[in-house]
């Protein structure tokens, strides 16, 4: 038995309730099938309305052996062929195509803008706390603590460039050594991969789409975690990154250059600056130990200021702190000196929404977080819808072949490296690995890009973001040039080392296998995706940080037994899979452990019970929202469930034994409507959701 056994159906015989479900279910999503419903023998099946409580059961069925859920779906064209259209139809089709393309660009623009606002929101909510993490210099000398600080700060501010610039400032002002900064940079690398994982969560509507999207996003996470797992101990033992970057800096003479062109920011800034503008220096000041910065707001109020340099008498501890002996005196009580003080004169206020609101940072952060996540979710659904309707037939075939086909033999191995370069180039253009990987996530979900191709593109994105950092470092002022360049190079060589570890030999492409495994689990237990996100990006780093505060002995005392236990489980798992004969009978599977220790099923039941309580309270809201959405998208045939009735009454009416009433079983989300009778489109892109998920 595997550690995470497949989920059985909620009822032993689902066919009792679902007509036409006698044969094995096809793994091709409904939207990719024809419009006529047939059973496996080919005979038409009467179209039935599924009971709300069981509308998701078909999706829970295990995919049959012959059908690999990781195979990219066929994006069939169910529309009228071009040749069959009349001239009016052709013109209409062209305009429709142009309209869809404009809409796609519009939603993509909104998507990128909402990512930017999301980052600002995170900074407002957790930016000051993130700065405080950095201000604790004593623990940062501990590489493990440094690593988790890097993760936490980047997760909190949703921007590796912000955390990197804080590190650069700290190194430049000798608050932090390059040696201590390297683990933090590694942590920042991990933290930045959370964004596309959050984006993947938005595709939880369709199991197979979610499976692919989540795996495609977490391949980035696994690459970063595995790289750190190997390279952090290596760096702690040998300091190879520090030495290598020192060598590079000494070998080549670097002059101040120009910063990387900020193509994307030029387009998105006019819009995002109308929503919110932040003073990112505040987080930096907190990190540098400026106590006054704690009381400053991150929200930028004045956008145009004039700096006046005035001479001011300031008190100093002793004449040694004076600007020069000529400008040092005492009034008999304190020692004074003359200093040039820059006074800021406010000229013009910023033009964003929150400029005149006297709301605290946290409140603005929560508002923006909610709004940006909703916009992000909406945009993603619309992008997936539009792509789904555009990428059909010949277009889909061409795009999929272009993206996923390897070069002819013997150059097939070069394809991946070209993908790495493409990923690096694209990231360099958009100036953000988060934007690139987040934009790629829905494409992986709908099956345009395979996980195998997404992996090198993601690795390239990791390289692209470091080349951007190198250029940014070259554009930095003289006093921070060396430190910022060394940190950018450390980041670069860390990613190069990671690629060398986990890419060249196909056998070592462990992140793909792990991501697929996580994708399978998350597709079945969708709440596990949220758990993964919270556990790996928040709870684990916070726990390690807490233990680090307690000191090395505590960290080692708690950490070593946990690591040994994980290694033991991994070894046992390997032996169970490879050579179970050498193991005693009891250890050949996990049945010797209680079910909750080796299966997600009991946990799933608990979460299902919890969400059923939640469902009772908010199902009516869902129904109202569903109707509003139906009106907005103009789909006349969508059905919103009558879930406002007490669920217990419904159960009595149906006289069906229910194991655990699950998440949002809203049939509105499963009923499909005809798009001019040609292709099927789901309402808001959401299919029937699992009976046992949190979503």
């Amino acid at each position: 038995m595997a550690p995470w056994p497949e989920l059985e159906n909620a009822h032993p015989n689902p066919n009792k309730f679902i007509e036409g479900a006698s044969g094995p279910q096809s793994s091709i999503p409904d939207k990719d099938k024809g419009t006529s419903k047939t059973n496996d023998s080919g005979t038409p099946v009467a179209k039935i309305e599924l009971l709300p409580s069981y509308s998701a059961l078909v999706l829970i069925e295990e995919p049959p052996e012959g059908n690999d859920p990781w195979d990219l779906p066929e994006l069939q064209d169910n529309g009228i062929k071009w040749s069959e259209r009349d001239s009016k139809g052709k013109i209409l089709c062209i305009f429709q195509g142009i309209g869809k393309f404009i809409l796609l660009l519009g939603f993509l623009y909104l998507f990128v803008c909402s990512l930017d606002v999301l980052s600002s929101a995170f900074q407002l909510v957790g930016g000051k706390m993130a700065g405080q993490f950095f201000s604790n210099n004593s623990i940062m000398s501990n590489p493990v603590a440094g690593l988790v600080i890097g993760v936490l700060v980047t997760v909190m501010v949703q921007s590796s460039s912000t955390s990197s610039s804080i590190i650069v400032s700290m190194v430049a002002s000798s608050l932090l050594s390059v040696r201590a900064a390297i683990p933090i940079i590694m942590g920042a690398n991990i933290g930045t991969s959370i964004t596309n994982t959050i984006v993947a969560l938005m595709q939880a509507g369709d199991r197979n789409e979610f499976r692919r999207a989540f795996a495609g996003a977490t391949v980035h996470d696994f690459f970063n975690w595995l790289s750190v797992l190997v390279l952090l101990p290596l760096e702690a033992a040998t300091h190879y990154l520090e030495k290598l970057t020192n060598l590079v800096l000494e070998t080549f003479s670097f002059q101040n250059g120009e910063d990387a062109p900020d193509i994307l920011k030029v387009i998105t800034d006019p819009f995002t600056k109308l929503i919110i503008q932040l003073d990112k220096k505040v987080i930096q000041q907190i990190a540098m130990g400026d106590s006054e910065a704690q009381n400053k707001s991150l929200i930028k109020i004045w956008c145009k200021t004039i700096s006046n340099v005035i001479e001011e008498n300031v008190t100093v501890p002793s004449p040694d702190n004076c600007t020069s002996p000529s400008y040092c005196w005492t009034d008999g009580i304190q020692t004074w000196t003359i200093q040039n003080v820059t006074e800021k004169e406010n000229i013009a206020k910023c033009q964003h929404i929150f400029v005149n609101f006297s709301l605290p940072d946290l409140a603005v952060g929560i508002i923006l977080l909610t709004v940006s996540l909703l916009i992000l979710c909406g945009c993603l659904i619309m992008i997936v819808k539009l792509l789904g309707s555009v990428l059909r037939g010949q277009v889909a075939t061409v795009i999929k072949k272009t993206l996923n086909t390897d070069f002819p033999f013997p150059f097939a191995w070069l394809t991946g490296y070209l993908a790495i370069l493409v990923g690096a180039g694209m990231t360099f253009i958009v100036q953000s690995s988060s934007v690139f990987t987040s934009a790629m996530t829905p494409l992986i979900g709908i099956g345009v890009i395979s996980i195998e191709r997404a992996y090198p593109l993601t690795l390239g994105s990791n390289i692209g973001t470091t080349t951007t950092a190198i250029l940014a470092a070259l554009a930095s002022p003289g006093n921070t040039l060396r430190s910022s360049l060394q940190i950018a190079l450390c980041h670069f060589f860390f990613n190069i080392s990671g690629i060398l570890l986990w890419y060249p030999i196909p056998f070592t492409r462990l992140p793909i296998r792990l991501a697929k495994g996580l994708g399978n689990i998350s597709a079945k237990y969708r709440w596990f995706a949220v758990f993964y996100l919270i556990f790996f990006f928040l709870l684990t780093p916070l726990t390690v940080f807490g233990l680090s505060l307690a000191g090395w002995p505590v960290l080692v005392g708690v950490g070593v037994p946990i690591i040994l236990l994980i290694l033991l489980v991994l070894c046992l798992r390997m032996l169970q899979a490879r050579c179970p004969r050498i193991l005693p009978l009891k250890l050949r599977d996990w049945n010797f452990l209680p079910l909750w220790m080796h299966s997600l099923k009991p946990w799933d039941n608990i979460i299902s019970l919890a969400t059923s309580c939640f469902q009772r309270r908010c199902c009516c809201c869902c129904r109202v929202c569903c109707r509003v959405c139906c009106m907005v998208c103009g789909c006349k045939c969508c059905r919103c469930s009558k879930c406002c009735k007490n669920l217990e009454e419904e159960e009595k009416e149906q006289d069906v034994p229910v194991k655990a009433s699950g998440g949002f079983d809203n049939t509105a989300m499963s009923k499909e409507c005809q798009d001019e009778g040609k292709g099927q489109v789901e309402v808001l892109g959401m299919k029937a959701l699992s009976n046992t998920t949190v979503f």
């Epitope: 000529s326 009034d331 008999g332 304190q334």
Partner: antibody
């Protein structure tokens, strides 16, 4: 006309305490730093203590730190020094002096006539 | 603490003479040095502040100069009322310190 008049001097046994006062007139008392400077018989001048115009900051020379307390009452134009745990070496003529405004190099531009403190058993 | 050393400790001069008193600081004090005159039984009176500025009401025969560690007070033409003890004082750093004084007597 600027005037500074000290009072409160006298004879005291070692270990005893005394409070000297300085009454100021003829200028805006609350705008100036005020000082106490002493001169032992037949010796040179020695700076003792100073207080800022608002009375929030003060300074004491090491030899009197912890024993003397300087204070001022701007509403009454009075400067005080409370001298505790007096030692024979504290015996001197105590002068009250006016300084410039805050943050200005210390110049004792006006002095009182002084009050004598005698410490002996 | 900054030590201030005056020389000579005492000097005799006649009316009309040009007299120079020097003051040396143990470390550079810029120009933050003041000169005082004290007559027996009286309170001191400021003559020169910040090394060379003449206090209002003080005759112009008193000239201050110097910077860093070496300073001089020059009385260009000695008058009967000038016979007194002269002190230098630094206002560079706390504690404020005075020189030991120079006694100027009639020859």
């Amino acid at each position: 006309e600027v005037q500074l008049v000290e009072s409160g001097g006298g004879w005291v046994q070692p270990g005893g305490s005394l409070r000297l006062s300085c009454a100021a007139s003829g200028f805006t008392f609350s705008s100036h730093i005020m000082y106490w400077v002493r001169q032992a018989p037949g010796k040179g001048l020695e700076y003792v203590s100073g207080i800022s115009s608002n009375g929030l900051s003060s300074y004491y020379v090491d030899s009197v730190k912890g024993r003397f307390t300087i204070s001022r009452d701007n509403s009454k134009n009075l400067l005080y020094v409370h001298m505790g745990s007096l030692k024979p070496e504290d015996m001197a003529m105590y002068y009250c002096a006016r300084g410039g405004r805050d943050r200005v190099p210390a110049v004792f531009d006006y002095w009182g006539q002084g009050t004598l403190v005698t410490v002996s058993s | 603490d900054i030590q201030m050393t005056q020389s000579p400790s005492s000097l005799s001069a006649s009316i009309g003479d040009r007299v120079t008193i020097t003051c040396r600081a143990s470390q550079s004090i810029g120009t933050f040095l003041n000169w005082y005159q004290q007559k027996p039984g009286k309170a001191p009176k400021v003559l020169i502040y910040v090394a060379s500025s003449l206090q209002s009401g003080v005759p112009s025969r008193f000239i201050g100069s110097g910077s860093g560690t070496d300073f001089t007070l020059t009385i260009s033409s000695l008058q009967p009322e000038d016979f007194a003890t002269y002190y230098c004082q630094q206002s560079y750093s706390v504690p404020i310190t005075f020189g030991q004084g120079t006694r100027l007597e009639i020859k």
